[in-house]
């Protein structure tokens, strides 16, 4: 699998999307891991429903959230209030048994806010009864991994 | 009505190559992963590998990498198993099976299956 | 790979029995497992899936129970049509491998 980049700005929210064939992959539910070294294991982050016919439901684990249209063979993941830590090499992943099929592989890449060094006055923050994700268009920028480029640095 | 027609019975000399056919008919044919499982003479059941003929992703089991070759045609409806060079311990029934998952399980089973195609290699 | 052991390998019974045969697995496969028939000379027919749901069309004398490693297929009240092989089989994970088979005969 080629590596795709998604790029989004720290405090953001960020929307991985992972397009895969709805008919291969039908009445299979879905996970998103983040990989743990280069040929580490991934790490099981969120998975959608247990029922799969419900798999359009957005479930969240802490500020990561995943949402499966099965129909239009896209799985969306939407990391809330994105940081430094967040960044690195993941999977969308397909599951059968207790296995999983790669659909894509990620690269999560962190970039500075812009606007985190103006004064605070110039900042506008929601109220607490408004929702993050209303407050914050959900956005990306991606790009795949050129020829040669790898995710992880090369170690000693 | 949900079929997988397999090709006839086949005997062969150690050595010489063969391709069987299974070709399915009633349901969507390039949507359906289709399953080769083996049966020994009076044994038991061996699954040999599947493909999705959709896009010819294919999973073969350790045992059988490398001995045979699993393809599709999705234009013809036909999936196929292959022998470069047979051998006397290829001798079996082999079944072609449509592998379907059920949606509040999210594994497979496989529930239609071919006549099985006898293959008997004999010098 | 994941072994399925059936036992026992052979089981004589009557019309009318009531038949338990078990399979065991040799890792944890949650309830990823069926049970296929298979009568001579022809295919194997899916039974059960996910280990306890019975297939459209197959008598509700069939039931199949368990999880994780140890699992049972029972028939009610034996017909003379259920006197065949009866086969169990993973789908926890590739490659999918299957029981060495129980013999159903008439005694």
């Known amino acids: 699998h080629n590596t795709t980049v998604f790029q989004g700005v720290a405090g953001q929210s960020l929307q991985v999307s992972c397009p895969y064939d709805s008919m291969k992959h039908w009445g299979r539910r879905k996970a998103w891991c983040r990989q743990l070294g280069e040929k580490g294991p991934c790490q099981r982050v969120v998975s959608t429903h247990n029922l799969w016919l419900l798999s359009f439901l957005r479930r969240w684990n802490g500020s990561t959230a995943i949402t499966d249209d099965t129909l239009g063979g896209t799985l969306t993941i939407t990391l809330r209030n994105l940081q430094p830590h967040d960044a690195g090499l993941y999977q969308c992943q397909s599951l059968h048994g207790s296995e999983a099929d790669t659909l894509r592989k990620v690269l999560v890449e962190v970039l500075a806010d812009p606007l985190d060094h103006r004064d605070a006055g110039d900042l506008w923050f929601p109220g607490e009864s408004e929702s993050f994700e209303d407050a914050h268009v959900e956005h990306s920028i991606s790009r795949s991994l050129l020829e040669g480029e790898i995710p992880f640095p090369p170690t000693s | 009505e949900v079929q997988l027609v397999q090709s006839g019975a086949e005997v062969k000399k150690p050595g010489e190559s063969l391709k069987i056919s299974c070709k399915g008919s009633?349901?969507?044919?390039?949507?359906?992963?289709i399953a080769w499982v083996r049966q020994m003479p009076g044994k038991g059941l061996e699954w040999m590998g599947i493909?999705?003929?959709?896009?010819?992703?294919?999973r073969y089991s350790p045992s059988f990498q490398g001995q045979v070759t699993i393809s599709a045609d999705k234009s013809i409806s036909t999936a196929y198993l292959q022998w470069s060079s047979l051998k006397a311990s290829d001798t079996a029934m082999y079944f072609c099976?449509?592998?379907?998952?059920?949606?509040?399980?999210?594994?497979?089973?496989?529930?239609?299956w071919g006549q099985g195609t006898l293959v008997t290699v004999s010098s | 790979d994941i072994q399925m052991t059936q036992s026992p390998s052979s089981v004589s019974a009557s019309v009318g029995d009531r038949v338990t045969i078990t399979c065991r697995a040799s890792?944890?496969?949650?309830?990823?497992l069926a049970w296929y028939q298979q009568k001579p000379g022809k295919a194997p027919k899916l039974l059960i899936y996910?280990?306890?749901s019975l297939t459209n069309g197959v008598p509700s004398r069939f039931s199949g129970s368990g999880s994780g490693t140890d699992f049972t297929l029972t028939i009610s009240s034996l017909q003379p049509e259920d006197f065949a092989t009866y086969f169990c089989?993973?789908?926890?994970?590739?490659?999918?491998?299957f029981g060495q088979g129980t013999k159903l005969e008439i005694k």
């Open positions: 099976a449509r592998s379907r998952t059920f949606y509040y399980d999210s594994s497979d089973y496989f529930d239609y």
């Open positions: 009633g349901y969507s044919f390039t949507s359906s992963w």
């Open positions: 493909i999705y003929p959709g896009d010819s992703d294919t």
């Open positions: 890792q944890g496969i949650s309830s990823w």
């Open positions: 996910a280990a306890s």
């Open positions: 089989q993973q789908a926890d994970s590739y490659p999918r491998t």
